[in-house]
Structure formats: C-alpha cells, structure tokens
C-alpha cells in the first residue's frame, strides 16, 4: 500500500471558462507565455485569452452509501511538487498518413495547439490539486448516481483506441452534480503509467497516483456531444485516483481480465454489463471540483471536473496488467498516457468538504485560504 497521508493541495472550481465556439479558434499564446518545464515535449499548452464563462444550472441525484477503509487523499503524505520526472510520452502514434495534424500523441510532435487551438486555452486540464488552497463549498452536495448498476446484457464495447482503453456505456446512466445539474454517462476510460512510474492525470500537491479513471458525462441540456463541446457545463467528468492495495478489486477485474483480447490498437471486445459505480470510490460526498477541459485534443473547455477525495484500490498485479498489456500504434506499448498538469490561471478549486483546514496543533484557528464561489446556489 502507498503513502499514508496526503495533505490538502490545490484549487478547483470557480472561474474556468468555456469556449463559445466548441472547436473554434482561440487566441493563441502570447510571446511571454513560454512552455513550462514539466510539459511533455510538443505540448506547449500556453494560455490564450478567453471570456470567462457563466455557470449553468444543473440537477440533483441520490447519495451513495459510505464505506470505510479506502484510502483518502487527506490521509496521504505531503510531497513536494518538483517538475514531474516522468514525462508523458506517447506510445500511441504512427505517422502513417503523413502530416495529418489530427494525429496527436503524448509527449511529441505535433504540438497540441496545432492539432486544436483550444489546447492553448487558459483553463485546461488536468491540474495539480492543492487542498490547502481549495475553497470549501458547503453547497456542493453528495453526487447522485442512478442506473449505474448494469445487468450483464446487453454487453458493452471495450476498445483499445490507441490512446486509452474505453468502455462505451449504454443510455440510462444518470448523474447529478447538484440540483438542476443533471448528466448522462457516455463512456469511461483510464490513464496510467508504466512499471514503477505513476500515470494519473491530476496530481495532489505534486503527487502523481498510479492511474486514474474518468467517467465522461453529457449534460441533459444537450442531445449530443458535438452540441456540448466548449459550452460551460456541457460535459462533466468524474475522476478517481487508482492506488495499490493488498487485495484484488473484483469490479476492475471484470475489465482488466479482458485487456489481452484488445491488446492491439483498434481492437475491441464485448464485456457483460457491470456495476459502473463499483469502479468509483464509495464516498460520493467528498470531492474537489473545478472547470477545465478535455485532457486530449480537441481540449474543449467548459468541462466540469469532479475529483474524488477517496481513492480506489487495485492490487499490484492489476495495476501491472493495466499498464503492461495494451499496445499503441506500431510496436509501441500504450503507456504513460497522461497529459502534463496545466496552470490554474486564477481558477479556484472548490471542495465539498473542509480540505484546507489544518487540524494540526500549530494552528490556533483553522485557516481556509479561498472562499467558496457558491456555484450552484
């Protein structure tokens, strides 16, 4: 098992912006915005100016019962956040069709803003979460999930798309971030590292976790993804960190046991329906939230990110299976498929719980550095 206690870290929430034109041109970075050291090569995601978004009202759902025993982020040690040593690289790319700029990859040419100008936006994902700087927002109620326990039939498509492993979800999985903030789940996918190298996209005080699950949702205000891209709140992603624990995770095993069948890029298989909520942490009440973007091109903004405080435990063998089974284009392994963390550029990450309160004896009074923007009130 990993680290025992992770101290609160970075901001989520309030002020990230969406694009009015989903995949339209954004202002590209100005000269003084130079690439950050921890960016993988070819991914100079420099800020461009944009209008700040208004927040959309969305829906409410039913809290999930709490289970004990999973590691919590606030139980992990504080770690320094130097430039990330493990550069995301792409092992999922082939320049088979010449200079096609839609052939993006991790950690190499072409630079992502050339693939999609939105990737140079000011409010990108992933980010480093620093709980001490998060704004406690009591208005952030427990997430509500409905219909996530799927019957075995119909089966679901599990595909190696060259960038990740993706499970396409059927209609009927409903999620609410709060009253009037309702969404439908579309798909889930994972990000991971390589042997001895963690591969989560978000970090907590610079700590990168072994892997991360993303469940992507479409707002019920939109019928299709193409209508929602770049609209504030049009898409919402539930994200959870995957950690090493002593036992096999039976929910994840239903997917991991099938990865060999889709080892080759582009291959797919059908898997029986399963309880999707079992792939997420049990505590739906403690999370960080901020507005960011898709973490792969086209990098459209306006995406509401909800990052669980509680982590999910997989066995060492399962994490190895995840990072060591799939292949990308050519003869390269599909590994280290994460984007470098992006600057907050003034965004404040919100927390549904007092993550920034220092309970150590040093502080006479609990200190919360940022105040809640009361989104959703």
């Amino acid at each position: 098992q990993r680290l025992p206690r992770m101290q609160e870290d970075s901001p989520l929430g309030g002020g990230s912006s969406g694009e009015d034109d989903p995949l339209g041109e954004e202002d590209l970075p100005s000269e003084e915005d130079s690439p950050r050291e921890e960016d993988p090569p070819g991914e100079e995601d420099l800020p461009g100016e944009e209008d700040l978004p208004g927040e959309e009202d969305l829906p409410e759902v039913k809290p999930k019962s709490e289970e004990e025993g999973s590691l919590k982020l606030e139980d992990l040690p504080t770690v320094e956040a130097p430039g990330d040593p493990q550069e995301p690289q792409n092992n999922a790319h082939r320049d088979k069709e010449g200079d096609d700029q839609s052939h993006w990859r991790y950690g190499g040419d072409p630079p992502w803003p050339r693939v999609s100008p939105a990737c140079a936006g000011r409010f990108q994902s992933p980010v480093d979460i620093r709980p001490q700087l998060a704004a406690f927002c009591p208005a952030l109620r427990p997430l509500e999930l409905l219909g996530f326990q799927l019957p075995p039939l119909p089966e679901l498509r599990l595909r190696n798309n060259g960038h990740s492993v993706q499970l396409t979800l059927p209609p009927g999985l409903e999620m609410a971030l709060g009253p009037g903030r309702e969404y439908r789940a579309l798909q889930l996918h994972l990000h991971w590292g390589a042997a001895g190298r963690p591969g989560s996209e978000h970090t907590v005080e610079g700590h990168r976790f072994p892997a991360e699950i993303h469940v992507v949702h479409l707002s019920t205000a939109f019928a299709r993804v193409d209508e929602a891209l770049g609209r504030p709140g049009g898409l919402a992603v539930l994200a959870a960190f995957l950690e090493e624990g002593p036992e096999e995770n039976s929910a994840y095993e239903q997917l991991l046991s099938r990865l060999e069948e889709i080892a080759e890029e582009g291959s797919e298989t059908q898997v029986p329906g399963l309880d999707i909520s079992a792939l997420l942490p049990s505590d739906f009440s403690r999370y960080f939230q901020y507005e960011g973007s898709l973490t792969t091109p086209p990098c459209a903004q306006g995406v509401i990110w909800t990052v669980f405080n509680q982590t999910v435990m997989l066995s060492a063998k399962q994490l190895h299976t995840l990072s060591d089974t799939l292949w990308g284009p050519g003869d390269s392994r599909l590994q280290l498929n994460f984007r470098a963390t992006q600057p907050l550029n003034g965004r404040v990450i919100e927390a549904s719980f007092p993550a920034g309160v220092d309970s150590s004896p040093r502080a006479a009074e609990p200190v919360q550095l940022n105040s809640c923007l009361a989104a959703g009130d």
């Epitope: 989903p22 995949l23 999922a92 790319h93 082939r94 320049d95 088979k96 069709e97 096609d100 839609s102 052939h103 993006w104 990859r105 999609s116 595909r159 798309n161 060259g162 960038h163 993706q166 396409t168 579309l186 798909q187 992507v216 479409l218 299709r224 993804v225 193409d226 209508e227 891209l229 898409l235 890029e265 582009g266 792969t296 091109p297 086209p298 990308g328 284009p329």
Partner: nanobody, 117 residues
Framework: QVQLQESGGGLVQPGGSLRLSCAAS???????????MAWYRQAPGKQRELVAV???????KYSDSVKGRFTISRDSAKNTVLLQMNSLKPEDTAVYYC????????WGQGTQVTVSS
C-alpha cells in the same frame, strides 16, 4: 447537427469490388478528426458486427472474415472514411454502417451491399 452519410453500396458479383464512403457533415464536423472511425455490418437475422476500425493515430484493425480483402482509410481533411472491399463473397451481403466514436457513438443510416451472381 453532425451527420454521417454512407454511399457506394450496391449489387456486385462474387469476386467483384466496391468502395464505400462515409462523409461527415454539420457544424461541428471537426470532432470527427478526433474520433475512431469504423465500419460495421448487419446481415438479415444477425447481430451487427465490426468490419474494420481506424483510430485517430491511423492504426487499423479488421475482423478475421475480411482481413486481406478490405481496407479502411480516412481523409481527415475531407472528413471522410473509406472502405475498399475487394474479392467480395456472398457472405459479405449486409447493410454497412459507418460509426464515429467520439465520447459517444455517431451512426450513419447504412448502405446495402449485395454480393450475388
């Protein structure tokens, strides 16, 4: 609203060739540059099956039944995906559907391919 439109189907003799095309249209047609594109087919009374897929990185995958006879390609600039079908057999008779997988599935209406003498 984005739409996928297949064309190129028809009646062909065994051993013959056809070239199916799938064109994307609509305001946000750009997103198909970032979609895995695939051809599926459905024969009468059978389940829809994957024929071929091309990922955003240009990687291709074929079902065993068409390997070596069919070729999938994409022209991202023109938002089209092609399926070149050679050495056609009667068992290739089906409705062929174009699919784009970008966060959700987009489907065309299908085009009929009939292989018969």
């Amino acid at each position: 609203q984005v739409q996928l439109q297949e064309s190129g189907g028809g009646l062909v003799q065994p051993g013959g060739s056809l070239r199916l095309s799938c064109a994307a249209s609509g305001n946000s047609v750009n997103i198909f540059r970032f979609a895995a594109m695939a051809w599926y087919r459905q024969a009468p009374g059978k389940q829809r099956e994957l024929v071929a897929v091309i990922t955003t990185t240009g990687g291709t995958k074929y079902s065993d039944s068409v390997k070596g006879r069919f070729t999938i390609s994409r022209d991202s600039a023109k938002n089209t995906v092609l399926l070149q079908m050679n050495s056609l057999k009667p068992e290739d008779t089906a409705v062929y559907y174009c699919n784009a997988d970008y966060l959700q599935d987009y489907w065309g209406q299908g085009t009929q391919v009939t292989v018969s003498s």
